[in-house]
C-alpha cells in the first residue's frame, strides 16, 4: 500500500522523484545543503515545485515531525503583511518576527520564524506527485 494515500496498489500510486518524500497527497524535498531564500526558491522552481506553502495547522504539525532545531526556508515573505508564495495570507499560525529587516519566513520543529532573506538555511520544496512513468 502507498503510505499516506488511498491507493490500493503501488503500481497505481502517483510517485515522487528520488530523494523526495511522499506525505499525504504531496511530495516534499528537504534539502541537505543551505542557500539563501531566493536561491532556495529558484531551486524549487527549477524542479517544477515551489518553496513550501503550508495550507493549514495540520500540515504544519505533520511536517514539523521531520524538522529539527535547524531552520528551513519556506515560501513565506513579508510584503506589507506575511503572505505565502501563492498569494494567500498567513492566517492559521503566527510567525516570530523581531525586526523590520527580517522579511523571509522559515520553519523549524518549534514553529515559524522570520529571518533576513540572505541567511543560508536549509529549505523545503513541495510539489504534486506524478503518475508512475511505467504506466504510460
Amino acid at each position: 500500500l502507498c503510505q499516506g494515500s488511498n491507493y490500493s496498489t503501488c503500481a497505481s500510486c502517483p510517485s515522487c522523484p528520488d530523494r523526495w518524500m511522499k506525505y499525504g497527497n504531496h511530495c516534499y524535498y528537504f534539502s541537505v545543503e543551505e542557500k539563501d531564500w531566493n536561491s532556495s526558491l529558484e531551486f524549487c522552481l527549477a524542479r517544477d515545485s515551489h518553496l513550501l506553502v503550508i495550507t493549514d495547522n495540520q500540515e504544519m504539525s505533520l511536517l514539523q515531525v521531520f524538522l529539527s532545531e535547524a531552520f528551513c526556508w519556506i515560501g513565506l515573505r513579508n510584503n506589507s503583511g506575511w503572505r505565502w508564495e501563492d498569494g494567500s495570507p498567513l492566517n492559521f499560525s503566527r510567525i516570530s518576527s523581531n525586526s523590520f529587516v527580517q522579511t523571509c519566513g522559515a520553519i523549524n520543529k518549534n514553529g515559524l520564524q522570520a529571518s533576513s532573506c540572505e541567511v543560508p538555511l536549509h529549505w523545503v520544496c513541495k510539489k504534486c506527485p506524478f503518475a508512475d512513468q511505467a504506466l504510460f
Epitope: N98, S99, F100, V101, Q113, S116, E118, V119
Partner: antibody, heavy 125, light 112 residues
Framework: QVTLKESGPGLVKPTQTLTLTCTFS??????????VGWIRQPPGKALEWLAH???????WYELALKSRLTISKDSSKNQVVLTMTNMDPVDTATYYC?????????????????WGPGTTVTVSS | DILMTQSPLSLPVTPGEPASISCKSS???????????LEWYLQKPGQSPRLLIY???NRFSGVPDRFSGSGSGTDFTLKISRVEAEDVGVYYC?????????FGAGTKLELK
C-alpha cells in the same frame, strides 16, 4: 517595543577593569537571528565597533582590542555584559549597546536596528 | 581595514532645500553573496545613532520617504529631498560587508 539601556560606573581609574551592562526588552536573545553589540564613541570622534554576541552565544571582537574584551549574555535576565580590562584615558567614550540582526555571517554584515541611549565612561586618575 | 570617507564633513542647508552626502569606501563593499551591506545612521544632538537606510537603499521602519540611499561598489550617496529642522545631526555611513566593520567619520548637517 524594542528598548536597550546601558549602565556602568561612569568613572574608572587607569589599569582598572570596566564592566558595562546592557539591559534590553522587546526581543529575546534566545531567538534565531538576534544579537547584541557594543559600539563606542570618543568625545567628538566617530563610532567604533567593539564586540557582539549572537543568540547561540557565538562571540566576536574587534581584533585590536580582543585581548582586553569579554562579552557575555544572560538571556533569562535580558542582559549582555561587556568587560574591558586595563583601561586607559584613550578609552574615555560614550559606550552604546545595540541590537544586531543576523544576515548570514557571524563576523560581519548585520544591521544595528535599535540602540541604547549610551553611557559615558571617563578614564582618569 | 576598509576606510569609509564621507564628504562634506559639514553641510549647512536651508530648510526645504535638498541635501546630499557622499560616502566612498577604500575598496568594493559588495559581498561575495552579491549583497552590499552599506548603511546610514543619523545621530541627532544628544541622542544615540538610529538606523535610516540598510543595504544601500532600503529605508528602515518609520524613516520618512524624503530620505533615500543609492550607489554601488565603492560610491554611495544619502539624499534628503527637502531638509526639515528635525534632520539636523551627524550622519554616518557604515560598511558591514567585510571584517572589521567600519564607520565613516560623519557629516554634520546644520541649518543655514
Amino acid at each position: 517595543q524594542v528598548t536597550l539601556k546601558e549602565s556602568g560606573p561612569g568613572l574608572v581609574k587607569p589599569t582598572q577593569t570596566l564592566t558595562l551592562t546592557c539591559t534590553f526588552s522587546g526581543f529575546s536573545l534566545s531567538t534565531f537571528g538576534m544579537g547584541v553589540g557594543w559600539i563606542r564613541q570618543p568625545p567628538g570622534k566617530a563610532l567604533e565597533w567593539l564586540a557582539h554576541i549572537w543568540w547561540d552565544d557565538d562571540k566576536w571582537y574587534e581584533l585590536a582590542l580582543k585581548s582586553r574584551l569579554t562579552i557575555s549574555k544572560d538571556s533569562s535576565k535580558n542582559q549582555v555584559v561587556l568587560t574591558m580590562t586595563n583601561m586607559d584615558p584613550v578609552d574615555t567614550a560614550t559606550y552604546y549597546c545595540a541590537r544586531v540582526i543576523y544576515y548570514g555571517s557571524r563576523s560581519a554584515y548585520y544591521s544595528m536596528d535599535y540602540w541604547g541611549p549610551g553611557t559615558t565612561v571617563t578614564v582618569s586618575s | 581595514d576598509i576606510l569609509m570617507t564621507q564628504s562634506p564633513l559639514s553641510l549647512p542647508v536651508t530648510p526645504g532645500e535638498p541635501a546630499s552626502i557622499s560616502c566612498k569606501s577604500s575598496q568594493s563593499i559588495v559581498h561575495s553573496n552579491g549583497h552590499t551591506y552599506l548603511e546610514w545612521y543619523l545621530q541627532k544632538p544628544g541622542q544615540s545613532p538610529r538606523l535610516l537606510i540598510y543595504k544601500v537603499s532600503n529605508r528602515f521602519s518609520g524613516v520618512p520617504d524624503r530620505f533615500s540611499g543609492s550607489g554601488s561598489g565603492t560610491d554611495f550617496t544619502l539624499k534628503i529631498s527637502r531638509v526639515e529642522a528635525e534632520d539636523v545631526g551627524v550622519y554616518y555611513c557604515f560598511q558591514g560587508s567585510h571584517v572589521p566593520v567600519t564607520f565613516g567619520a560623519g557629516t554634520k548637517l546644520e541649518l543655514k
